[in-house]
């Protein structure tokens, strides 16, 4: 039945970067500007997406394809496609409804969107800590005495807890 | 004993797709974040992308974004890379690595390294 | 241009003491950890080195690293010819949202 009905179909013909024009006996036009089709035999073309405000153009928008949007610097993408752009924060920080706010101590953020996360609880795998953790930096687990080999990192005991957001250099 | 074998590489012309596959073995393939990390011929090592196996999370290259996807198949034990639009400059082995620090206790990979690579498999972009 | 900056090149007599460094930034090196790779020719890298200063079970205790602000090193005693490779820094970039490598540094051993 399909077979049959694009024989029949003067649409089907229509390539993608043109529609079926209905106002001109279902000729193949193209599509107009600001417009795409990113498929064979539309009977429209779509409005191509605009990249405004606090959106910027990652990839302009063609007769077979949408145009794709990221942030501006300071802010990032979140949802299918960059549907909404979400401020940045520093290493060490998390977003807040009052805005980028100092990760608490015993919690890190390693990057600059996303929550503050518990450090890492090394004695959960049965090992040391061998680096204390930051408000910017998870706590390193160290190997457990059984897994020590020559050659491997000796397990440091923890250091006096720091205060956060002084980096271990 | 950690292996990863890299294969879906080959000579594609530019503008072309190519899918990489790196099948995991010897450890715990969904506790672990894994990368793809490229080297063009007598050049350095490039970070291509990684993704998490607890929320899904992925990261790209500026040289890459937009154009590769990074995914994986727990079940299946495998790491993906769909290379789409490749370019000239893409050309290089492209090598499959683990990262040290098992999820979900290990909050973050980022100290641990990667401390598993497969031998790589070549990526030709030529017409 | 790599994000982390490493010599060219380096060389060492064996037995000699030879470093590595690579510089970045606040946003790299200053507050994430560094790893250090050895890639012998023809091979696959090898992790040297994690959370700065850290050596993997069975990496020998000729190879150390440290790390002192936004730059960091390595530093190879007892220089073999074995030791012959390429070397790279790596870390997290949070303002990246990524990974980085140093551009390598070929070691030889004369």
């Known amino acids: 039945f399909e077979r049959t009905r694009s024989l029949q179909d003067p649409c089907s013909n229509c390539p993608a970067g043109t529609f079926c024009d209905n106002n001109r006996n279902q000729i193949c036009s193209p599509c107009p500007p600001n417009s795409f089709s990113s498929a064979g035999g539309q009977r429209t073309c779509d409005i191509c997406r605009q990249c405004k405000g606090v959106f910027r153009t990652r990839k302009e928008c063609s007769s077979t394809s949408n145009a794709e949007c990221d942030c501006t610097p300071g802010f990032h993408c979140l949802g299918a496609g960059c549907s909404m752009c979400e401020q940045d924060c520093k290493q060490g920080q998390e977003l807040t409804k009052k805005g980028c706010k100092d990760c608490c101590f015993g919690t890190f953020n390693d990057q600059k969107r996303g929550i503050c996360r518990p450090w890492t609880n090394c004695s959960l795998d049965g090992k040391s800590v061998l680096v204390n953790g930051t408000k910017e930096r998870d706590v390193v687990c160290g190997p457990s005495p059984a897994d020590l080999s020559p050659g491997a990192s000796s397990v440091t005991p923890p250091a006096p807890a720091r205060e956060p957001g002084h980096s271990p250099q | 004993e950690v292996q990863l074998l890299e294969s879906g590489g080959g000579l594609v012309q530019p503008g072309g797709s190519l899918r990489l596959s790196c099948a995991a073995s010897g450890f715990t393939f969904s506790g672990y974040d894994m990368s793809w990390v490229r080297q063009a011929p007598g050049k350095g090592l490039e970070w291509v992308s990684v993704i998490y196996p607890d929320d899904g999370n992925t990261y790209y290259a500026d040289s890459v974004k937009g154009r590769f996807t990074i995914s994986r198949d727990n079940s299946k034990n495998t790491l993906y890379l769909q290379m789409n639009s490749l370019r000239a400059e893409d050309t290089a082995v492209y090598y499959c690595?683990?990262?040290?620090?098992?999820?979900?206790?290990?909050?973050?990979?980022?100290?641990?390294?990667?401390?598993?690579w497969g031998q790589g498999t070549l990526v030709t972009v030529s017409s | 241009q790599s994000v982390l900056t490493q010599p060219p090149s380096a060389s060492g007599t064996p037995g000699r003491r030879v470093t590595i460094s690579c510089s970045g930034s606040s946003s790299n090196i200053g507050n994430n950890y560094v790893t250090w790779y050895q890639q012998l020719p023809g091979t696959a890298p090898k992790l040297l080195i994690y959370a700065d200063s850290h050596r993997p079970s069975g990496v020998p205790d000729r190879f150390s690293g440290s790390k002192s602000g936004t730059s960091a090193s390595l530093a190879i005693s007892g220089l073999r010819s074995e030791d012959e490779a390429d070397y790279y820094c790596a870390t997290w970039d949070y303002s990246l949202s990524g990974y980085v490598f140093g551009g390598g540094t070929k070691l030889t051993v004369l």
């Open positions: 690595a683990k990262h040290g620090g098992q999820k979900p206790t290990t909050k973050s990979s980022s100290a641990y390294g990667m401390d598993g």
